[in-house]
């Protein structure tokens, strides 16, 4: 659900954190229409997720803690 590197919508399924290697934040006030978390998977896919949803917040927290502890 992305176009020109902007997410236009969100995935409707929960991704498991074991498949995710990182994320980037998309901000609506920086040239895109919606706020989003873009998860980067081991298979080199980019998945747009809703930053307000609980599962997304947990994964962002998990990945951020991993980076901090590196």
């Amino acid at each position: 659900a992305s176009n020109f590197d902007c997410c236009l919508g969100y995935t409707d399924r929960i991704l498991h954190p074991k498949f995710i290697v990182g994320f980037t934040r998309q901000l609506a006030n920086e040239g895109c229409d919606i706020n989003a978390i873009i998860f980067h998977t081991k298979k080199k896919l980019s998945v747009c997720a809703n930053p307000k949803q609980t599962w997304v917040k947990y994964i962002v927290r998990l990945l951020s803690k991993k980076v901090k502890n590196m």
């Epitope: 929960i14 498991h16 954190p17 949803q53 599962w55 917040k57 947990y58 927290r61 803690k65």
Partner: antibody, heavy 120, light 111 residues
């Protein structure tokens, strides 16, 4: 009606441990995160930690690292909270509360609470 | 010491309007919706407001919530005796500290 039913009151000696259960009835177990919140007598609410069954992952509050273990049993749709090295300061009511994984981060349903008394 | 700051008490007479404030920071209220819980003495907390201004089914419309910047507020209009309870604000925190934070609670007394 969806409910979270917790185990009964416990009395423990200092330095021992306690395990409290939270059985969910209704709703898909893996669609939720199960959180533990405690309330000391006359005090406010304190988040302790959570378990995310679909991720098989637990997250612990800073004040409880090292002595808190939260687990879940999908077959019985039950979450557990075990707290070790108890002191009288751990005397409190312990609540479980659920959060929808696909949704915002609010506790929509709470258990009835379990009173844990730590006394010598 | 709670991450979110609430006044310890508030009061009003039946029919009055009472407002409770909840102050936080950029990593919590500033970037996440606020939830409010009501705890009647001797019972478990109950969800009162979620997503800053949404009421779950069954919550009377005399309860309303709002959020601006790093602060939120809960208003009770037409105060009733059964509203006497403790009220807690809560939200997610994007810092790497505890992800769920609460205010210290506000005891509402109906005079």
């Amino acid at each position: 009606e969806v409910q979270l039913v917790q185990s009964g009151a416990e009395v423990r000696k200092p330095a021992s441990s306690v395990k409290v259960s939270c059985k969910t009835s209704g709703g898909s177990f893996n669609d939720y995160s199960f959180n533990w919140v405690r309330q000391a007598p006359g005090q406010g609410l304190e988040w302790m930690g959570s378990i995310i069954p679909v991720f098989d992952m637990a997250d612990y509050g800073q004040n409880f690292q090292g002595r808190l273990t939260i687990t879940a049993d999908e077959s019985t749709t039950t979450a557990y909270m075990e707290l070790s090295d108890l002191t009288p300061m751990d005397t409190a009511i312990y609540y479980c509360a659920r959060v929808a994984m696909v949704g915002a981060t609010h506790f929509d349903i709470w258990g009835q609470g379990t009173l844990v008394t730590v006394s010598s | 010491q709670s991450v979110l700051t609430q006044p310890p008490s508030a009061s009003g007479t039946p029919g009055q309007r009472v407002t409770i404030s909840c102050s936080g920071g950029s990593s919590n209220i500033g970037s996440n919706p606020v939830n409010w819980y009501q705890q009647v003495p001797g019972t478990a907390p109950k969800l009162l407001i979620y997503l800053s201004d949404q009421r779950p089914a069954g919550v009377p419309d005399r309860f309303s919530g709002s959020k601006s910047g790093t602060s939120a507020s809960l208003a009770i209009s037409g105060l009733q005796s059964e509203d006497e309870a403790d009220y807690y604000c809560s939200t997610w925190d994007d810092s790497l500290n505890d992800p769920v934070v609460f205010g210290g609670g506000t005891k509402v007394t109906v005079l």
